[in-house]
Interface confidence: medium
């Protein structure tokens, strides 16, 4: 990703206490959970690589940045961070690499200031549709989330629950239209074969979308038209063969966009002509001079920008009676 790293930040707000929050006695002001390191000055708690199996109950109320990385949490239940008084200042929550395989509905409820959430590198076989919205209402209260990092959350093949992994993730992103304010979404390294057609239209605030290192073959049914604020679109290391006219026109129409297309297996035949013409004219593609053909064999490693229409032919398809073995 070309933008600054999605590290937990000190961004926060104050918020009213939530009477419905749960959990034990409020922690003492200077209390720090066992196996954690706390800095009140930095408003940061780090419980890193400690093989924790659940979220500590006695998190200090001042926490703004919470790192729970490298643990063995397995399941994040509803209200996993609900406390009395609530963690009203918690703005950045990093749960990456903590062996989570299930995130239940309402797992992040009662975190009124949560702006950044990183669930990367967890094998999420079961991500509830209401993990982020917290309720099954058709329109939920807006989530405060602005940045959602879901890189490499695909579980091993044998742990998937006989359903589309793409569909499961998208259901969680769209439930209750709670993530209308989401500005950064990272979905890299998830073996996505396709992007459900309605997902982007319902995330109109996106500025940064990272779909790199997936297995996307085509963007034909994906519309970028509504994403008028999109600044970066990462599509490196996918299985894209060609971008068609409709996609090219939509990308060109986005006022702030930068698109990253490196390391895709571009097929340089007659269907590539429009894309090559567009590449020569556009300024939205970063590193466009690095894009090369993968197929057909005779075109391998040719630079797309150096192709002309004579190079881009389609072998005629012979009628069955004339085909040779």
């Amino acid at each position: 990703s070309s933008s600054p790293t999605s590290s937990a930040s000190s961004f926060s707000s104050s918020a009213p206490f939530l009477a419905s929050a749960v959990s034990a006695q409020p922690p003492l002001p200077d209390q720090c959970p066992a196996l954690c390191e706390c800095s009140e000055a930095a408003r940061t708690v780090k419980c890193v690589n400690r093989n924790l199996t659940e979220v500590p109950t006695d998190l200090p109320a001042y926490v703004r940045n919470l790192f729970l990385t490298g643990n063995q949490l397995a399941v994040l239940p509803a209200g996993a961070f609900a406390r009395r008084p609530p963690l009203a200042e918690l703005a950045a929550l990093n749960l990456s690499g903590s062996r989570l395989d299930e995130v239940r509905a309402g797992a992040f409820e009662h975190l009124p200031s949560l702006r950044q959430l990183d669930l990367s590198h967890n094998p999420l076989a079961d991500l509830s549709p209401f993990a982020f919205s917290g309720s099954n209402a058709s329109v939920s209260a807006p989530s405060p989330l602005v940045e959602l990092i879901l890189n490499h959350i695909v579980p091993p093949e044998d742990e998937r629950q006989n359903r589309s992994f793409e569909g499961m993730v998208v259901a969680a992103l769209l439930a209750g239209r709670a993530l209308q304010g989401l500005r950064r979404l990272e979905l890299a390294s998830n073996h996505f074969l396709y992007l459900p057609r309605d997902v982007l239209a319902q995330l109109p605030s996106l500025r940064h979308l990272d779909l790199s290192n997936n297995s996307l073959v085509s963007l034909t049914y994906v519309s970028f038209r509504n994403l008028t604020h999109l600044e970066s679109l990462h599509l490196e290391d996918n299985a894209l063969k060609v971008l068609h006219n409709g996609t090219l026109a939509e990308l060109q129409g986005l006022p702030h966009i930068r698109v990253f297309l490196d390391n895709n297996p571009w097929v340089c035949d007659c269907h590539m002509a429009d894309m090559v013409t567009w590449l020569k004219e556009t300024e939205v593609v970063q590193g466009k001079d690095r894009l090369t053909c993968a197929y057909p064999e005779k075109m391998r490693n040719r630079v797309l920008l150096e192709l002309n229409s004579a190079d881009l032919d389609c072998d005629p398809i012979l009628p069955p009676s004339l085909q040779t073995s």
């Epitope: 070309s2 933008s3 790293t5 961004f11 602005v146 304010g181 500005r183 940064h208």
Partner: antibody, heavy 119, light 106 residues
Framework: EVQLQQSGPELVKPGASVKISCKAS????????MHWVKQSHVKSLEWIGR????????TYNQDFKDKASLTVDKSSSTASMELHSLTSEDSAVYYC?????????????WGQGTLVTVS | FVMTQTPKFLLASAGDRVTISCKAS??????VGWYQQKPGQSPKLLIY???NRYTGVPDRFIGSGYGTDFTFTISTVQAEDLAVYFC?????????FGSGTKLEIK
């Protein structure tokens, strides 16, 4: 503690250039955009642009595209802005400002400002 | 996006409730913030995303609004609130500010 320490006031002649700096400390310098803002009596606060210290990528307000150049020196955690072809209209206080979420432009931290006088 | 801020000046006594308005030329969702700039100082972030108080900001500072109309209220003015207040949109680059409201205390 996050701190942005700007260079001192500058008195420059019309047509000249000036480079002002902003030394950052107390956070991961390459992790967040650095923004620059102009404050003058004429136009209040104006956003000039931002730079990504991670890779040097810049985004400018078109009104300042030919006026300002933003750079960073990662080794010293310093952001700089050079102003070109100065006129009296460029006399102002210039601030570096930090947003602590990379997708937003709420400026939670500001430098103390650098006064540039063109005369 | 033009942010039109009114009034330019406000005169209030300690204990008063004051309100500042900011109108965007087009919808900016809830992407508006408010800053306070005391004499001789840099601006300070008070409110972001229209209604969220930044860390450490007293709860007498209140923001509201959505779309094109935004309001900033100081529920009980105190002497130390003497400052210029600015709105800002963070909806789309270039990010733009209102012209400011100078609050003076009687």
């Amino acid at each position: 503690e996050v701190q942005l320490q700007q260079s001192g006031p500058e008195l420059v002649k019309p047509g000249a250039s000036v480079k002002i700096s902003c030394k950052a400390s107390g956070y991961s310098f390459t992790g967040y955009y650095m923004h620059w803002v102009k404050q003058s009596h004429v136009k209040s606060l104006e956003w000039i642009g931002r730079i990504n210290p991670y890779n040097g990528a810049t985004t400018y307000n078109q009104d300042f595209k030919d006026k300002a150049s933003l750079t960073v020196d990662k080794s010293s955690s310093t952001a700089s802005m050079e102003l070109h072809s100065l006129t009296s209209e460029d006399s102002a206080v210039y601030y570096c400002a930090l947003s602590t979420m990379i997708t937003t432009a709420w400026f939670a931290y500001w430098g103390q400002g650098t006064l540039v006088t063109v005369s | 996006f033009v942010m039109t801020q009114t009034p330019k000046f406000l005169l209030a006594s300690a204990g008063d409730r004051v309100t500042i308005s900011c109108k965007a030329s087009q919808s900016v969702s809830n992407d508006v913030g408010w800053y306070q700039q005391k004499p001789g100082q840099s601006p300070k972030l008070l409110i972001y995303f229209a209604s969220n108080r930044y860390t450490g900001v007293p709860d007498r500072f209140i923001g509201s609004g959505y779309g094109t109309d935004f309001t900033f209220t100081i529920s009980t003015v105190q002497a130390e609130d003497l400052a210029v207040y600015f709105c800002q949109q963070d909806y789309s680059s270039p990010f733009t500010f209102g012209s400011g409201t100078k609050l003076e205390i009687k």
